[in-house]
């Protein structure tokens, strides 16, 4: 799945600069590409480490450049390696001196298993020495000096994979520096076969493409693309999708292209020779000019593209009539997609003619895994491939590639996928309060594991041993209603982030139990002061149907001091409680309920004052009104909180002795007026009012005067009495 290309410029080294450039075309591989010496092929070559640099002219390429003064150190075998999914893709090549005694016919030679092979070297220097031939540095053959032919050949009948390797030729007095190299590549399978047992027929690879024995795919020569290598690239371009360009003034002249085995090395289309610096002669095209144009209708033979078909014709020889082929295009694929971890169904949509088939559309993950479509359909002018990734995870983030490879060409579109971790609360929700049929819950989504933002929250709840139900919630505090009393519940929160499948795994579970339905409050509640520091609460005896033990919970609070609160548990068989250790002259509020395991309902609040620790103040706002010849109305107000138990009205006729007064004692402190009766007409009286509590009576500051009216015959003596 990696488009790795090694450009050897030039394999025959003279005194000029020479280089190796390794290009990972299409998209960035996971691991860096490396260039090194191929000691497997040639053990005794130079040991100096290579100075590998980044090729600044390309997005993802490495380069080794030798200056002319380093010429003596260059001879040997080299490789470029890229890794995908831990598997190495290695491309091999060689460099040799242009002044070598022999030169190979080709830099590499690819044959099928079982082929009869002749590896040949051309004698370019005549010497009176034996010629020697080596394979991977090991001696295989010698030719006596007087028998060295112009073409030195190694004959291999029935080629086998173990015959593959680097063959070198030199005179016996020479060395690595004067050796010529050629590499034999032997396909594991017989011609036109591929597969583990070589039983599957290869696609016919056009334009000298080579069928890969492991995949059955065509490795296309530089300048051709597509499933069958039928589609010619634009001149001076190369790579699986023809996206790479030769930057030289004459295009790909002097560039030897090496591709993964079993392709080997060749010139780009339109060029031939060991140095790829000879243009194809008329009527020839393709890599190494090995292809001949046989244009059906005498169309132009282009040395780069072959027959240039006129409108309405197609095929290598323009022999087919019909709609012209259109290189596939990938449509509507965004550059960046954010997805949630879990199931992922990426879609690749492509146009072109013929429309791509399901087998021609693939998706390549960042680790190099190639996915085939799970679902496929044709819509309008497009092929739509739907892929299924059952579990996409954050490590799958990176550059994915939609790849379409048809007879009309190949196109790849990289796009970035960012896989987000689904959010999951770190803590269980908190139960703030519960009743017999409700629970108040704090659904705090923070902190959470995974990626935000949080789009929505679901509160999952269920009675233990039942199915989960959920409610979408927005607020942090939520009241869950309509619960069953005295039931164990489980709660958890599920968070969701934006996008399809954004719901995370529910967080930790919280258990709680709803209360039982409570008993009614005690009946006949009465709250009375007992002393300056105690109040007495009483109620009627309690009878329940429940077998559960019960008790009375009494809550008392001071109305003056809000922090002063006490809850007292009273055994259920008692009917009163003394609330002691209170503050004198303070008002308290008290309520009670009957609790079993469940809490009962609270009673209404009762209020009472503790007895006073000081004398009461004088009644205030004393008024004498409605005076007649024998009656007068006396009114007053008293200040609350002094445990006033009675009011004393004392009156006497002016001028009479002190001991001749009359006292009226009103024992109901809530009475605020009294009618004095039986008074003498036209008489002046002195009236005093006292408040009385547990400590004593108040001290009047002054007496109030009252003078009755003259006698009126109409008024009858009805006797003294109070008027409320």
């Amino acid at each position: 799945a990696m488009d790795l290309i090694l450009i050897n410029s030039l394999p025959l080294v003279s005194d000029a600069e020479t280089s190796l450039t390794c290009i990972a075309s299409g998209w960035h591989p996971h691991e860096p590409i490396t260039i090194g010496r191929d000691f497997e092929a040639l053990m005794n070559q130079h040991q100096d480490p290579l100075e590998v640099t980044q090729d600044v002219t390309r997005e993802w390429a490495k380069k080794v450049v030798w200056k002319r003064e380093k010429a003596s150190k260059i001879n040997g075998a080299y490789f470029c390696e890229g890794r995908v999914r831990g598997q190495a893709i290695r491309i091999r090549t060689m460099k040799m001196r242009q002044q070598a005694s022999f030169l190979p016919a080709t830099l590499t030679m690819t044959v099928d298993r079982g082929d009869n092979v002749n590896i040949s070297f051309k004698k370019v220097l005549i010497k009176e020495e034996d010629a020697v031939i080596y394979k991977n540095g090991s001696f295989i053959h010698s030719v006596p000096r007087h028998e060295v032919p112009d073409i030195l050949e190694v004959h291999l009948p029935h080629a086998q994979p173990q015959d593959a390797g680097v063959y070198s030729a030199r005179y016996i007095g020479g060395n690595l520096f004067t050796s010529a190299f050629t590499r034999l590549i032997v396909r594991r399978c017989e011609a036109q076969k591929w597969g583990p047992d070589c039983s599957r027929p290869c696609t016919t690879c056009k334009n000298n493409g080579v069928c890969h024995e492991d995949t059955g795919e065509c490795i296309c020569p530089p300048g051709f693309m597509g499933r069958t290598c039928e589609k010619a690239c634009e001149p001076h371009t190369f790579g699986r999708t023809c996206k790479e360009r030769c930057s030289g003034p004459e295009g790909c002249k002097s560039y030897v292209f090496c591709l993964p085995d079993p392709y080997g090395c060749s010139c780009a289309t339109g060029w031939r020779g060991l140095q790829c610096n000879e243009a194809c002669p008329s009527g020839y095209y393709g890599p190494d000019c090995k292809l001949r144009c046989h244009c059906t209708n005498e169309e132009i033979c282009d040395r780069f593209q072959g027959c240039l078909c006129s409108q309405g014709w197609q095929g290598l020889q323009c022999e087919k009539e019909g709609r012209p082929r259109m290189t596939p295009q990938i449509e509507d694929l965004p550059d960046h997609i954010e997805v949630n971890s879990g199931k992922f169904n990426p879609i690749c949509k492509a146009s072109g003619w013929p429309l791509p088939t399901s087998e021609e559309m693939t998706l390549v993950k960042p680790d190099g895994t190639v996915l085939q479509p799970n679902d496929f359909n044709y819509t309008d002018r497009f092929s739509v491939a739907i892929f299924t990734v059952n579990r996409v995870l954050p490590p799958d983030s990176g550059v994915w590639v939609c790849s379409v490879n048809t007879v009309a060409g190949m196109v790849e579109k990289p796009f970035n996928i960012s896989v987000k971790v689904l959010p999951e609360p770190l803590h269980a929700p908190n139960v703030i309060d519960t009743g017999h049929n409700f629970a108040i819950i704090n659904i705090s989504s923070e902190p959470y594991f995974g990626d935000g933002p949080i789009k929505s929250k679901k509160l999952f709840y269920k009675p233990v041993n039942q199915a989960w139900k959920y409610i979408e919630v927005t607020n942090e505090i939520f009241t869950l209603n309509y619960l069953e009393p005295r039931t164990d519940y489980e709660l958890c929160v599920q968070l969701a982030r934006p996008g399809e499948g954004g719901e995370g795994h529910p967080g930790p579970v919280r258990r709680f139990t709803t209360a039982s339905i409570g008993l009614p409050p005690p009946r006949g509640l009465s709250l009375l002061p007992k002393s300056q520091t105690a109040l007495n609460l009483t109620w009627q005896p309690i009878f329940t149907n429940s077998e559960d033990e019960f008790y009375v919970e009494v809550e008392r609070r001071s109305l003056q001091t809000t922090s002063d609160q006490q809850n007292i548990k009273v055994p259920g068989n008692l009917t009163s409680v003394l609330l002691s250790n209170l503050v004198p002259r303070e008002q308290y509020t008290v309520r009670a309920r009957v609790n079993t395991k469940a809490q009962g309902e609270w009673s209404e609040e009762l209020r009472a004052w503790t007895l006073s620790d000081i004398l009461p103040p004088q009644p205030e706002n004393i008024k004498i009104s409605n005076i007649t010849d024998s009656t007068a109305m006396v009114s007053w107000t008293i200040v609350d909180g002094y445990s006033i138990s009675s009011i004393i009205i004392r009156y006497k006729v002016q001028g009479k002795n002190e001991d001749q007064h009359i006292d009226v004692k009103i024992k109901n402190a809530t009475v605020t007026q009294y009618q004095l009766k039986g008074l003498e007409p036209e008489t002046t009286y002195h009236v005093d009012i006292f408040a009385e509590n547990n400590i004593g009576s108040s001290n009047p500051a002054f007496s109030h005067e009252l003078r009755t009216l003259p006698h009126s015959p109409a008024s009858a003596d009805l006797g003294g009495g109070k008027m409320l």
Epitope: L156, P157, D163
Partner: antibody, heavy 119, light 107 residues
């Protein structure tokens, strides 16, 4: 697994003939060279002859040229050494050996068969 | 024919010793030399080919070197199973020729 099995050895009178066979298995017979190497009792190794079964090319040691003939039947994956005009100095253990791809070293050897030339 | 001369013709050594056997060719044979081990009553076994390449399955205590006319077989630490006769062979030209052998015996 590569195997070479010689047969046909025995006692023969001087001037007599003998045909040795070498049955090969476990490799591509026609893609290898097959040699015969002999070892006289208590002596060193001496190369006798070789053949390329693919094209029938043959080579002989000077000591046996004209008397011995090496041949191969690719349909049976078998090489033969026809020995005529045998001499006492031909007495030896005869090994069939494979040269693999090129006529260089011998990477597989048979167990050997003894040829005794005596009156 | 190219003559291959081995020395010594025999040697005595102990287990653990470093043993060196040399072979001289009568003319330049490049690196076209192989070394074999033979035990009594058995066929020879290939140890080294092309002067310095260790044949597969052969222990790494065996090594070969040389080029041109002078070649060496070295056993870095002699083992009990290494007591045998060793032959060099040139394959530079036809006929291939063998050295006369070196017998390695227990001291």
């Amino acid at each position: 697994e590569v195997q070479l099995v010689e047969s046909g050895g025995g006692l023969v009178q001087p001037g007599g003939s003998l045909r040795l066979s070498c049955a090969a298995s476990g490799f591509t017979f026609s893609g290898s060279w097959i040699s015969w190497v002999r070892q006289a009792p208590g002596k060193g190794l001496e190369w006798v002859a070789r053949i390329n079964p693919y094209d029938g090319n043959t080579y002989y040691a000077d000591s046996v040229k004209g008397r011995f003939t090496i041949s191969a039947d690719t349909s049976k994956n078998t090489a033969y050494l026809q020995m005529n005009s045998l001499r006492a100095e031909d007495t030896a253990v005869y090994y069939c050996a494979r040269n693999n791809r090129f006529p260089t070293w011998f990477d597989y050897w048979g167990q050997g068969t003894l040829v005794t030339v005596s009156s | 024919d190219i003559q291959m001369t081995q020395s010594p013709s025999s040697l005595s050594a102990s287990v653990g010793d470093r043993v060196t056997i040399t072979c001289r060719a009568s003319q330049d044979v490049s690196t076209a030399v192989a070394w074999y081990q033979q035990k009594p009553g058995k066929a020879p076994k290939l140890l080294i080919y092309s002067a310095s390449f260790l044949y597969s399955g052969v222990p790494s205590r065996f090594s070969g070197s040389g080029s041109g006319t002078d070649f060496t077989l070295t056993i870095s630490s002699l083992q009990p199973e290494d007591f045998a006769t060793y032959y060099c062979q040139q394959s530079y030209t036809t006929p291939p020729t063998f050295g006369q052998g070196t017998k390695v015996e227990i001291k």
